[in-house]
């Protein structure tokens, strides 16, 4: 008799990552009967919503539904119709919305309210939209990468099925860089976490984890740039800002009102004798690096050791996965290879920043000029943050792995968020049972 294929017994889940600069929709899929196994959930689609982050719609909230349509429609196409009603949809908003909430809780609530109403119109099982905390963002990022790397599996393997995998069950630390915040999360080595706010306890698959995490609001790459500009314009003698973080020959006019729009620049705010100023790039890595370091207050630390701004940071331990903008920026700069030393990265950044703007524009014609102009700053910022902010060294640099995807799934907080909300990470190790009846044909 001919074997007839049984209908695939699978489940789907959707998570929207509403970041400060854009929104991405992720569709996940897993075998229904293996929900509690580690490593079975994988991403089948990412749809990047065209346009800015949801916080930019604060003055036109009625258009949020239009903005989300294409990606939600894409989800309807990808997920079989029979599964629509049981597919959960979650939206998590991160630091862009945290900043909006700091400015106005009412406006942030209004944005989320319209998001919820828009997403409720689709045939899925909408589970809510909320602003996740920085601590959650760090924790879920850590869960995601370790889940995908197979670190929670108790079965020891003699072969490696994923990149970066060592046979030990040592978890990877997680380094996440967004537009408005950055997170560092890892298991310290037998070190007490001196500040309770930075301590997380998990029991996953029968094992306890004491995890350190911190989210630095305003230290994502976009908000760090606004901070730097606000700091530097304070000491400019006129409305020209000669900026080492932009390529020689680059020019851009900035409105002072835009500069002071974000809560991240409040500490640098002052009355300026002009409404606009012009950035003129001079393309000098060393000077750019020095300017960025002034954003990190390292003069005060109430703990045994700190990252910056008085925030406790235990000694770094083990390997780290650096993802999101850490990866995108370094990928653009062609610096993600495991073989590239920190000294080499610095050298390459010096050369890149010194390249004339006209030359850069010609070399990267397909890249939006706004993004293209900021890679010198972003690359320099990443080095400054990792080396001076988090205290990586030339030696420990080799423990940083710039990761975009693991096993086809994007590294980021969304998978961990969904695994948690769908109760797919058991506290105890599931008992290994014989084949279920559904396996027999």
């Amino acid at each position: 008799t001919q074997n007839k294929a049984l209908p695939e017994n699978v489940k789907y889940g959707i998570v929207l990552d509403a970041g400060s600069s854009h929104t991405s929709l992720y569709i996940y899929k897993w075998p229904a009967e293996k929900e509690n196994d580690t490593g079975v959930v994988h991403q089948v689609e990412e749809c990047r919503v065209k346009g800015p982050g949801i916080s930019k719609f604060v003055q036109k909230v009625n258009e949020i539904g239009i903005y989300l349509t294409d990606c939600m429609e894409r989800a309807r196409e990808v997920i079989p119709r029979s599964q629509h009603q049981e597919t959960p949809v979650y939206l998590g908003a991160t630091a862009g919305m945290r900043l909006l909430r700091m400015e106005s809780e009412e406006l942030a609530d209004r944005v989320l309210d319209v998001v919820e109403r828009s997403l409720s119109n689709y045939p899925f099982d909408f589970q809510g939209a909320r602003i996740i905390t920085g601590q959650e963002e760090g924790a879920y990022g850590w869960i995601t990468i370790n889940y995908l790397l197979g670190k929670f599996s108790q079965k020891t393997r003699w072969f490696s099925i994923v990149p970066y995998e060592t046979n030990n069950q040592e978890t990877f630390g997680a380094l996440d860089l967004g537009g408005a915040s950055t997170q560092v999360t890892f298991v310290p080595q037998n070190q007490t976490i001196e500040s309770p706010d930075n301590a997380l306890q998990f029991r996953l698959y029968g094992k306890d984890y004491n995890v350190y995490t911190h989210s630095f609001l305003c230290y994502g790459k976009d908000q760090a740039l606004w901070q730097k500009l606000a700091k530097d314009i304070q000491v400019a003698s006129n409305e020209i800002l000669r900026d080492p973080c932009f390529h020689p020959g680059y020019k851009k006019v900035v409105n002072v009102s835009d500069l002071y729009k974000t809560p991240c620049t409040k500490r640098f705010e002052m009355t300026l004798p002009f409404q606009q100023f012009e950035i003129q790039g001079i393309g000098n890595y060393q000077q750019c690096h020095q300017s960025i370091l002034e954003l990190f207050n390292t003069s005060y630390c109430p703990y045994s050791q700190c990252a910056f701004n008085g925030i406790f940071l235990p000694p770094l331990q083990g390997d780290f996965g650096a993802f999101s903008a850490f990866y995108f920026v370094m990928k653009f700069l062609n610096l993600t290879s495991e073989k590239v030393s920190q000294e080499k990265v610095t050298e390459m950044m010096k050369k890149f920043c010194a390249q004339p703007w006209e030359e850069i524009k010609t070399s990267y014609a397909g890249v939006k000029e706004k993004y293209l102009s900021e890679y010198c700053f972003s690359g320099t910022y990443i080095l400054s943050l990792l080396l001076q902010g988090y205290h990586f060294t030339a030696d420990s640099w080799e423990h940083i792995h710039f990761i975009g995807k693991i096993q086809g799934s994007d590294a980021g907080w969304t998978l961990g968020y969904m695994l948690n909300l769908t109760n797919m990470i058991p506290a105890e190790q599931p008992l290994s049972t014989p084949l279920s009846h559904s396996t027999y044909v």
């Epitope: 749809c47 990047r48 065209k50 346009g51 800015p52 930019k56 689709y122 890249v367």
Partner: antibody, heavy 121, light 111 residues
């Protein structure tokens, strides 16, 4: 500023294939959709199809099924429309267009200057 | 396919007057709480220009005298007051489902 520069006018024989390009400057095509619209002489507008250059998903009018290919080369920031088995009724001005939200949540639209395709024996 | 009908085919008005252009769809173009109806203006020898998207939202840089309304199957583009540069052909387009269809157009001419 954003500019869409289309390739020049084409004269083709029935049954031939044409490939029209749309080169975008000042904006990354990955950040929006590229639409193709045509307009026969002295007639109205007709939507042909669109592409999402970020993932090459395309949607188009089924009446072009088997004859139409819409592609994009993000490294060149250029979109392409290829139409085969040409017939006289394909004679039209072909436009590429971008529309969607920009970084400040303003809804923009940008159009190419148009490419006149004449199909004649 | 969704068929769009525009009326009138031609409209002759003077500068300063109000123009009301209508577009009717063969079936509802509403979905997910949104009306997927757009309006374009086209002048001779030029590409079209987006005026209104999602029934009532103004495109970037479009003057406030252009407004859109309607839902379901019946939509209206209003231009008030008319200015000399507004005399052109106006098309409605639905983007609810593929193929995104255009109406046949309304020609707005000077009286």
């Amino acid at each position: 500023q954003v500019q869409l520069l289309q390739s020049g006018a084409e004269v083709k024989k029935p049954g031939a294939t044409v490939k029209i390009s749309c080169k975008v400057s000042g904006f990354s095509i990955k950040d929006t959709y590229v639409h193709w619209v045509r307009q026969p002489p002295e007639q109205g507008l007709e939507w042909i199809g669109k592409i999402d250059p970020a993932n090459v998903n395309t949607k188009f009018d089924p009446k072009f099924q088997g004859r139409l290919t819409i592609t994009a080369d993000t490294s060149k920031n250029t979109a392409y429309l290829e139409l085969s088995s040409l017939r006289s009724e394909d004679t039209a001005v072909y436009y590429c267009a971008l529309y969607g939200y920009d970084d400040d949540a303003y809804y923009f639209d940008y159009w190419g200057q148009g490419t006149l395709l004449t199909v004649s024996s | 396919d969704i068929v769009l009908t525009q009326s009138p085919a031609t409209l002759a008005l003077s500068v300063g007057q109000r123009a009301t252009l209508s577009c009717r769809a063969s079936e509802s173009v509403d979905n997910y709480g949104i009306s997927f109806m757009n309006w374009f203006q086209q002048k001779p020898g030029q590409p079209p220009r987006l005026l209104i998207y999602a029934a009532s939202n103004q495109g970037s840089g479009i003057p406030a005298r252009f407004s859109g309304s309607g839902s379901g199957t019946d939509f209206t583009l209003t231009i008030n007051p008319l200015e000399s540069e507004d005399f052109a052909v106006y098309y409605c387009q639905q983007s609810k489902e593929v193929p995104y269809t255009f109406g046949p157009g309304t020609k707005l001419e000077i009286k």
